[in-house]
Interface confidence: low
Amino acid sequence: LQDPCSNCPAGTFCDNNRNQICSPCPPNSFSSAGGQRTCDICRQCKGVFRTRKECSSTSNAECDCTPGFHCLGAGCSMCEQDCKQGQELTKKGCKDCCFGTFNDQKRGICRPWTNCSLDGKSVLVNGTKERDVVCGPSPADLSPGASSVTPPAPAREPGHSPQHHHHHHGGGGSGLNDIFEAQKIEWHE
């Protein structure tokens, strides 16, 4: 016997309370596949999140971050404040890199300057808060037949792995009940 719900296309759900009629997904919900018995809530791009792609009856909304913030996590689950080059984001906001460290991006942490002497090289160009040092050639590099030396491009900050911040709430008055009322899913820092 064929499941009557299998005839319900994407954008609808099989409504058990109406004799398994294929009902359209209500506003702000979607079903991306046929035969679904529920529609999923559309992601709401609110606050620091910005809508990159509107939700439709068959696909979820996609968010990115407003200017001055950048995405973190799978599917842009969080927005983190941008800092200037030469700074890093701390719990107290953007702070200048300490002496001996640099950050050449608007995100990420300050990293130590390269230690040229570890490779037997000298410092050709001093480091700044925004740039790594440039190491000069070692004596071996200048021996006959050596390749020409070009300063290395500054190392790029590796991509952030998804981070999960947890807001811990206890008891009945958790302040999260509005999720079930307004059906908003937002990141609150």
């Epitope: 759900f13 409504d15 058990n16 309370n17 009902s23 997904c25 209500p26 506003p27 702000n28 919900s29 991306s32 596949a33 018995r37 529920t38 529609c39 999923d40 809530i41 992601r43 979820n60 996590g73 799978a74 599917g75 689950s77 969080m78 998804p162 981070q163 999960h164 911040h165 947890h166 807001h167 811990h168 709430h169 206890g170 008891g171 009945g172 008055g173 958790s174 999260l176 009940n177 509005d178 999720i179 079930f180 009322e181 307004a182 059906q183 899913i185 937002e186 990141w187």
Partner: antibody, heavy 123, light 112 residues
């Protein structure tokens, strides 16, 4: 249709920690919540907390605050419940369940449950 | 926390006869959006719980129409119009109108 498949039974010593996984297969992972519910032998159901897989925040019952950590990895469609400082009274079957705050059906209810993971705490 | 109290705790039933389980909450479950998130679950022996009813009275997919829910505010009832042998197990009510979610202590339904 979505299924929730949990990790296998565990035997733990008092004072240690246990981490139970719950993998979703066959559907969206990021648009609903995962709750964890436990059931001690011969007892009723007790809600421990919930997590939203993409937003990353978790809500915990006061009783477990500080001892439980609920997380999710959207890339593998897996939720985790870690309980620390285990004692004998934590011996129970631990269930994950899909918790749906959606417009149509069903709201504020657990429509899909994992098969349960028995955690035995014994010295 | 909201306390959910079920009665009776044990219910011997005769197949074909009706059965009724009561669930009371320690405070109103009507949420600010005028919704009441009260659901009912059946846990058959050796199985995970399964959803029967949500939002007081809405039957979940595949649940036979002999199951019905009713109530409002703080008093809720699950009725089985004609009990069948497969209906045995422990029935739980649960509120999700506020955190933390809380369950009733369960009602064990068994055949006489």
């Amino acid at each position: 249709q979505v299924q929730l498949v949990q990790s296998g039974a565990e035997v733990k010593k008092p004072g240690s920690s246990v981490k139970v996984s719950c993998k979703a297969s066959g559907g969206e992972f990021s648009n609903y919540f995962i709750s964890w519910v436990r059931q001690a032998p011969g007892q009723g159901l007790e809600w421990m907390g919930m997590v939203h897989p993409i937003e990353g925040w978790a809500v915990y019952a006061q009783k477990f605050q500080g001892r439980v950590t609920i997380t999710a990895d959207e890339s593998t469609s897996t939720a985790y419940m870690e309980l620390s400082s285990l004692r004998s009274e934590d011996t129970a079957v631990y269930y994950c369940a899909r918790d749906r705050p959606v417009f149509c059906c069903p709201r504020g209810a657990f429509d899909i449950w994992g098969q349960g993971t028995l955690v035995t705490v014994s010295s | 926390d909201i306390v959910m109290t079920q009665s009776p705790l044990s219910l011997p039933v005769t197949p074909g006869e009706p059965a009724s389980i009561s669930c009371r909450s320690s405070q109103s479950l009507v949420s600010p959006g005028d919704n009441t998130f009260l659901s009912w679950y059946l846990q058959k022996p050796g199985q995970s719980p399964q959803l029967l009813i949500y939002e007081i009275e809405r039957r979940f997919y595949g649940v036979p129409d002999r199951f019905s829910g009713s109530g409002s505010g703080t008093d809720f009832t699950l009725k089985i119009s004609r009990v069948e042998a497969e209906d045995v197990g422990v029935y739980y009510c649960m509120q999700a109108s506020t955190f933390p979610r809380t369950f009733g202590q369960g009602t064990k339904v068994e055949i006489k």
